[in-house]
């Protein structure tokens, strides 16, 4: 008999839904130069509201008016463009709402220029056709706010063109970004107009601005990076998986178990078995067989595939997942029907992905 047995209750405590640390994109408010703009902070029960622009505290001045939950910008200029945030401070917590302001006129070579990155290969512009820098693929720049788990890699892009070909430099919080400003430095791929930081840490939080310039002009674009520290928790299994299945004798079936875990999870597929006609040992614990587990020799441990099933394969299949914090398990039943009976639920073969990191 296997040395492993399930002793804890298989019911899962309700937990917060799994997060992949994605933050919805901020709303964008567009204004033409000279226009006035009014934005309301969309946070409830805000006792005290503070405002920032590109991570820097925003106070009232002759063009910026802050009244309660409203921000007013009078006579907007392109310099007012950026990532704004209002933070509501309450007695027990605080909450931040982000939004973008884009002050641009119709002929500006700004963020809303059409994506022109359709050519198979880059073609140099005519040397006589002088042109100030412009964005070539604004689609790759739409996501301004990046909330990333610690230890992940982050890439910011500013694909641009111009003649002569512009140069690109990067600022962090408005100052020159130097390699020594972060452990491990960073990578810049000029041909891809990208900045890459590996293994991000909380001190990498801030605003990153690409400045693209040639002798005919300069454009810039700011990204905001938030580094989310991972909160260890036991594995979370997606509700409803694995799902009950039925198939005929000789058929194939798959059980899928979707796992959310920051810490490396170990996945096991277990089935109750009988030994000498008994389902339980002398100690009262059930006889269990580990059918599959994650490891070097096991690909796609989230999926248990059974081929050419027999009636003996019917029964309960348990997906048990553990990490160093704890464990979780959920089960499903397989019904094996005689050949002449059609199954209630047809087999679905999907290439299910592995556990979420």
């Amino acid at each position: 008999r296997p040395s492993f047995s399930l002793v804890e209750d298989t019911t899962l405590e309700p937990e917060e839904p799994p997060t992949k640390y994605q933050i919805s994109q901020p709303e964008v408010y567009v204004a033409a130069p000279g226009e006035s703009l009014e934005v309301r902070c969309l946070l409830k029960d805000a006792a005290v509201i503070s405002w920032t622009k590109d991570g820097v505290h925003l106070g009232p001045n002759n063009r910026t008016v802050l009244i309660g939950e409203y921000l007013q910008i009078k006579g907007a200029t392109p310099r007012d463009s950026g990532l704004y945030a209002c933070t509501a401070s309450r007695t027990v917590d605080s909450e931040t709402w982000y939004f973008m302001v884009n002050v641009t006129d119709a002929i500006s070579s700004g963020d809303d220029e059409d994506d022109t990155d359709g050519a198979e290969d880059f073609v140099s512009e005519n040397s006589n056709n002088k042109r100030a820098p412009y964005w070539t693929n604004t689609e790759k720049m739409e996501k301004r706010l990046h909330a990333v788990p610690a230890a992940n890699t982050v890439k910011f892009r500013c694909p641009a063109g111009g003649n002569p070909m512009p140069t690109m430099r990067w600022l962090k919080n408005g100052k020159e970004f130097k390699q020594e400003h972060r452990i491990g430095g960073y990578k810049v791929r000029n041909q891809h107009w990208s900045l890459i930081m590996e293994s991000v840490v909380p001190s990498d939080k801030g605003n990153y601005t690409c400045v693209v310039e040639n002798e005919y002009g300069s454009i810039n674009h700011t990204y905001h990076l938030d580094v989310v520290e991972r909160s260890p928790h036991r594995p979370i299994l997606q509700a409803g998986l694995p799902a009950n299945a039925s198939t005929v004798v000789g058929g194939d079936v798959e059980f899928v178990c979707k796992v959310y875990s920051d810490a490396q999870p170990h996945i096991q597929w277990i089935k109750h078995v009988e030994k000498n006609g008994s389902k339980y040992g002398p100690d009262g614990l059930p006889y269990l067989k580990v059918l599959k587990h994650s490891g070097i020799n096991s690909s796609n441990a989230e999926v248990l595939a059974l081929f050419n099933v027999t009636e003996a394969d019917a029964g309960e299949y348990i997906c048990k997942v553990s990490n160093y914090i704890g464990q979780a398990n959920q089960s499903a039943w397989l019904t094996v029907l005689p050949k002449q009976q059609a199954p209630g639920r047809e087999k679905e073969i999907t290439a299910s992905p592995d556990y979420l990191e």
């Epitope: 693929n137 890699t153 891809h192 590996e198």
Partner: antibody, heavy 119, light 107 residues
């Protein structure tokens, strides 16, 4: 048309060195980043190293860092991979590949050259 | 480094079948994912770049989708010449890691 032709492979003893070359033609070599990708017998693809068109940027897979050096001579339209301190696990077919503009997708590949590290 | 996990590792299919291969990244890689086809003794061939763009000269039965961590390569109607090994590759991080490959065999 675009052509990439690798050379320099062969049998070498563990600890030895080898220099691979990749002759490029049919495109403006200096406009493109180039990579080396290898494939051990019966195994999958493993990216090895990349170099930007002007040589200003290079990067290596952890498995070869400190032992392999990528370089290019744009006047000769040639990419190089200097491999030192070779190990048995470096045995593979080595491909040179061109990166698409604005994307690190390898749109053209050479036919590959076999490197065998064995005593 | 970012890990790329392909599934299934192999599959058997018939000519005319719709085939789906998935690739999962260990972190968000935006749309920085490419798909390649490789036949025995040959160099790989680029099929799809940046998750969903069909490379010039590749038949339209090949398509790619996905962003973030989960990506899919679909062959809408498998042809005899499509039996090969398929690889995904991320280019979000400086080390352009490949998936372990999916072998598409004749049923």
């Amino acid at each position: 048309q675009v052509q990439l032709l690798e050379s320099g492979g062969g049998l070498v003893q563990p600890g030895g060195s080898l220099r691979l070359s990749c002759a490029a033609s049919g495109f403006t070599f200096s406009d493109y980043a180039m990579s080396w990708v290898r494939q051990a017998p019966g195994k999958g693809l493993e990216w090895v190293s990349v170099i930007e068109g002007d040589g200003s940027y290079t990067h290596y897979a952890d498995s070869v860092k400190g032992r392999f050096t990528i370089s290019r001579d744009n006047s000769k339209n040639t990419l190089y991979l200097q491999m030192n301190s070779l190990r048995a696990e470096d045995t593979a077919v080595y491909y040179c590949a061109r990166e698409k503009t604005y994307s690190s997708a390898f749109d053209y590949w050479g036919q590959g050259t076999l490197v065998t590290v064995s005593s | 480094d970012i890990q790329m996990t392909q599934s299934p590792s192999s599959l058997s299919a018939s000519v005319g079948d719709r085939v789906t291969i998935t690739c999962r990244a260990s972190q968000d890689i935006s749309s920085d994912l490419n798909w390649y086809q490789q036949k025995p003794g040959k160099a790989p061939k680029l099929l799809i770049y940046d998750a969903s763009n069909l490379q010039s000269g590749v038949p339209s039965r090949f398509s790619g989708s996905g962003s973030g961590t989960d990506f899919t390569l679909t062959i809408s109607s498998l042809q005899p010449e499509d039996f090969a090994v398929y690889y995904c590759q991320q280019h979000y991080s400086p080390s352009h890691t490949f998936g372990q490959g999916t072998k598409v065999e004749i049923k």
